[in-house]
Interface confidence: low
Amino acid sequence: EPPTACREKQYLINSQCCSLCQPGQKLVSDCTEFTETECLPCGESEFLDTWNRETHCHQHKYCDPNLGLRVQQKGTSETDTICTCEEGWHCTSEACESCVLHRSCSPGFGVKQIATGVSDTICEPCPVGFFSNVSSAFEKCHPWTSCETKDLVVQQAGTNKTDVVCGPQDRLR
């Protein structure tokens, strides 16, 4: 009775169970009653990352420097190349097919989380008592100056974009 299902790492062809090619190798010819499955290693800059019956290996991903990409991990016959972005840029997707410049936080917003190669800058509004007067990918919201600790008084109130302005206390003569 010909098999209808095969064991793990096998495939059914012509009513026969043949061995799959191991990762890093491609199928050249199916097994027969008398011969084993014939597999060949993937060429340079090619890979296959699973047990397979593929007749062609996949090309390694190209980390295109024109799109701000560079190689994070070189591919092998069993793994694809992993791309990342040049410093100051981050990937636009998990696959990292292209990069964009890190976002800056506008005045009134501070950096909550600095960008990485795979995630953008996370900004947060400066809460009451804090300000940011610059557009920056690194600066957090700064606390308003404490006039009291300098024995001064608030002359001009602070905003989310400006620090308070301190001035001398009016002393009764």
């Epitope: 799109l67 097919e97 964009v100």
Partner: antibody, heavy 119, light 110 residues
């Protein structure tokens, strides 16, 4: 002082091919992406294409096959046009990108060269 | 190529006023967006890039914001020197790389 200057413009007849040259002074452009942009009289800006620092060239869809960008030296970039029509009458600008990669940030511009296509 | 829709085509505001210009991209362009100012007879001048980064030497009265498909340029405390045409330039760098300008906004300062 870093400057870009376009040359090669002028009055040409329809069907003519033309080569415009962008020359940098004060620095070389080998580590920057160089872009070409045009502007018809009284109209908006139109992006043509870019050559990156590593020599890869990208064209706007409408410009593919109509223009050829090449880097002639570390200080010059050329824009070759094929079979000009009256619709190609425009001021042609070259502009340097902020990095060597493709970018929308074009920080240094030439004054432009006017190409007039007329019979 | 990505299509950039810029609004309004023209705007008139008094000195000291505020102008807001919007650019909408036909697809997600992340923060690949720059803003330019152009006065007659002059080449464009870069105001900001990467959506919210101000170019060197540009007044902090100009500010850019947005991400993905919606972007804004705000000019506050308008001065006579701000009278110009403003353009956005959006870039898509996926499988079809390309930059596209918006149609422009003429700013008249009264």
């Amino acid at each position: 002082q870093e400057q870009l200057k376009e040359s090669g413009g002028g009055l040409v007849t329809p069907g003519t091919a033309l080569t415009l040259t962008c020359t940098a002074s004060g620095s070389d452009i080998s580590s920057y992406a160089m872009n070409w942009v045009r502007q018809a009289p009284g109209k908006g800006l139109e992006y043509i294409g870019v050559i990156t620092s590593s020599g890869t060239i990208y064209y706007a869809n409408w410009a593919t096959g109509r223009f050829t960008i090449s880097k002639a030296s570390s200080t010059t970039v050329d824009l070759k046009t094929t079979r000009l029509t009256t619709e190609d009458t425009a001021t042609y600008f070259c502009a340097r990108g902020i990095t060597g990669a493709v970018t929308t940030g074009l920080s240094l511009w030439g004054p432009g060269t006017l190409v007039t296509v007329s019979s | 190529d990505v299509v950039m829709t810029q609004t309004p085509p023209s705007v008139s505001e008094p000195v000291g006023g505020t102008v807001t210009i919007k650019c909408q991209a036909s697809q997600n362009i992340y923060n690949n967006l720059a803003w330019y100012q152009q006065t007659p007879g002059q080449p464009p001048k870069l105001l900001g890039y990467a959506a919210s980064n101000l170019a060197s030497g540009v007044s902090s009265r100009f500010s850019g914001s947005g991400y993905g498909t919606e972007f804004t340029l705000t000019i506050s405390d308008l001065e006579c020197a701000d009278a110009a045409t403003y353009y956005c330039l959006g870039g898509y760098y996926g499988n079809n790389v390309g930059n596209t300008f918006g149609g422009g906004t003429e700013v008249v300062v009264k």
